[in-house]
Amino acid sequence: NKILVKQSPMLVAYDNAVNLSCKYSYNLFSREFRASLHKGLDSAVEVCVVYGNYSQQLQVYSKTGFNCDGKLGNESVTFYLQNLYVNQTDIYFCKIEVMYPPPYLDNEKSNGTIIHVKGKHLCPSPLFPGPSKP
């Protein structure tokens, strides 16, 4: 049995930040689980991890330098990413593993979410500013 994952097909990060919600066909309440977000078609970069263990506090971290956090719902984990760069525009996949209670479960690979990071464009100064007033 595999857990099904639903993600938005595309998100735009306007202020270099985005919230990506991973919705699962499984209730995570009172489960030991590891939810993660992966970057790239081959999911080679593990962007963020949210680890939950029953009623204990969530452990949230990135080993790859992303500024991330995560919020748990009964059947979802929302990943918060900040300080994204334009060159981090890519496809991102949600992954979920349930370690306890048995049996171990993980997800069917989702369709992923394309996160398009829009750069902050500053208005250029005019080449020839108007005459200054005396």
Partner: nanobody, 121 residues
Framework: EVQLLESGGGLVQPGGSLRLSCAAS????????MEWVRQAPGKGLEWVSS????????YYADSVKGRFTISRDNSRNTLYLQMNSLRAEDTAVYYC??????????????WGQGTLVTVSS
Amino acid sequence: EVQLLESGGGLVQPGGSLRLSCAASGFTFPGYTMEWVRQAPGKGLEWVSSITPLGANTYYADSVKGRFTISRDNSRNTLYLQMNSLRAEDTAVYYCAKDIRYTGTYNFDYWGQGTLVTVSS
């Protein structure tokens, strides 16, 4: 070099308020869960509160729930603890602590020198 510098402690009457600050440097502050812990005179270390890297989750000890609020400003590399409705039993040295990443809360690798909070009439 990692540094955590607490401030804002002092003498306050029961029912009063204080806001503690912790200025962090020497590490990537937005990448870590941060904690407040305290040590009352003659007692052991007690966990008070924690906040996940971007502030999405906050946790509190039962003894302070509803009275204390943890927050952080990642642009300023600063952790805060707003303490309201203070009681005599809140008297302690308060330390901010940086979590060892990947291990979750209650595991600290650095903490500050502390700031003393005294609640007395």
